[in-house]
């Protein structure tokens, strides 16, 4: 699912107050939530009928440094007997996450959000089927 | 996929550099990758064997405000007749993201990130099957 | 709508080659996947190779691994299968595939014939 562009309002001071100065906010330390887990069932991508594989993507001036991409394992789908069924279609599943850039000059430090799209798994779709003339 | 927890040293300067204020630190505005865009296919949630609605919640005081949400549609998968297969499992794949959540006090304003569990979609997952004695 | 345009079929003989092409325009934004199929005379549909848009990941079909091979050009969306040590077992109408993951475009065939 897509992230919508960021209002200018977001980041302003209510009305009736005197104005931000331009280009930075305050960012508190710590992160709301922080021990906050997935719960996804064990092994989902190798036991899905559209199996994907793993890969991190590392940056240490990034948060999360780490950043996991899936890939679909197959063009088609894993049938009850265990095999490519091409006839369906393995298709990703997407969705544009935040990330924190931290930025740094000499001993100048700042951060801002960056967008990411990530791959999270795959799907398992029936395609409609055109027969182009 | 889980995001790790924010390590000490994120937020610090070089070692060399003087130290930073505790609690907080300047954040750009703007968003790095703003128009990078999901490119995924329409309907799939509708034509996936595990198919999904979407709920949106909505937070003026968080970016971005809107979050959307996958709940699957049924228990099982859908097979190739159009019905529901409850030998297989429709499974919610999660993804832990990042939210801005700006908090006032008056009209002093600050920012700080939130981990938030979303829902993106749904896959057909084979259960393991165990007899308990 | 979508059009797809299919190129390279004829006649070859035994431990011959030929390249197959297939360029799809019109509505063709988000593939997922393009490929090809064969039907030979009297027999069924069958996969033969695919390639996936996003990071080039191949799929070949047992009986053309080693001796077909699938690329695309995703500034002219357009597949193409490199059909080398042909067999007369590989004679049929090639199929082409466009798969926009939710819907899947099939062209009208070009007909390879291996014959001596």
């Known amino acids: 699912r897509k992230i919508p562009k960021v209002g200018h309002t977001f980041f302003q001071k209510p009305e009736s107050c005197p104005p931000v100065p331009e280009g930075s906010m305050k960012l508190d330390t710590g992160i709301i939530n922080e021990n906050q887990r997935v719960s996804m069932s064990r092994n989902i991508e190798s036991r899905s009928t559209s199996p994907w594989n793993y890969t991190v993507t590392w940056d240490p001036n990034r948060y999360p440094s780490e950043v996991v991409q899936a890939q679909c394992k197959h063009l088609g789908c894993i049938n009850a007997q265990g095999k490519e069924d091409i006839s369906m279609n393995s298709v990703p599943i997407q969705q544009e996450t935040l990330v924190l850039r931290r930025k740094h000059q000499g001993c100048s430090v700042s951060f801002q959000l960056e967008k990411v799209l990530v791959t999270v798994g795959c799907t398992c779709v029936t395609p409609v089927v055109h027969h182009v003339q | 996929r889980k995001i790790p927890k924010v390590g000490h040293t994120f937020f610090q300067k070089p070692e060399s550099c003087p130290p930073v204020p505790e609690g907080s630190m300047k954040l750009d505005t703007g968003i790095i990758n703003e128009n990078q865009r999901v490119s995924m296919s329409r309907n799939i949630e509708s034509r996936s064997t595990s198919p999904w609605n979407y709920t949106v919640t909505w937070d003026p005081n968080r970016y971005p405000s809107e979050v959307v949400q996958a709940q699957c549609k049924h228990l099982g998968c859908i097979n190739a007749q159009g019905k529901e297969d409850i030998s297989m499992n429709s499974v919610p794949i999660q993804q832990e993201t990042l939210v801005l959540r700006r908090k006032h006090q008056g009209c002093s304003v600050s920012f700080q990130l939130e981990k938030v569990l979303v829902t993106v979609g749904c896959t057909c997952v084979t259960p393991v099957v165990h007899h308990v004695q | 709508d979508v059009q797809l345009v299919e190129s390279g079929g004829g006649l070859v003989q035994p431990g011959g080659s030929l390249r197959l092409s297939c360029a799809a325009s019109g509505r063709a934004s988000s593939i997922n996947w393009m490929g090809w199929f064969r039907q030979a005379p009297g027999k069924e549909r069958e996969f033969v190779a695919g390639i996936r848009w996003s990071d080039a990941y191949t799929e070949y079909a047992d009986s053309v691994k080693g001796r077909f091979t699938i690329s695309r050009d995703n500034s002219k969306n357009t597949v193409y299968l490199q059909m080398n040590s042909l067999r007369p077992e590989d004679t049929a109408v090639y199929y082409c595939?466009?798969?926009?993951?939710?819907?899947?475009?099939w062209g009208q065939g070009t007909l390879v014939t291996v014959s001596s």
């Open positions: 595939v466009l798969d926009l993951s939710t819907v899947r475009y």
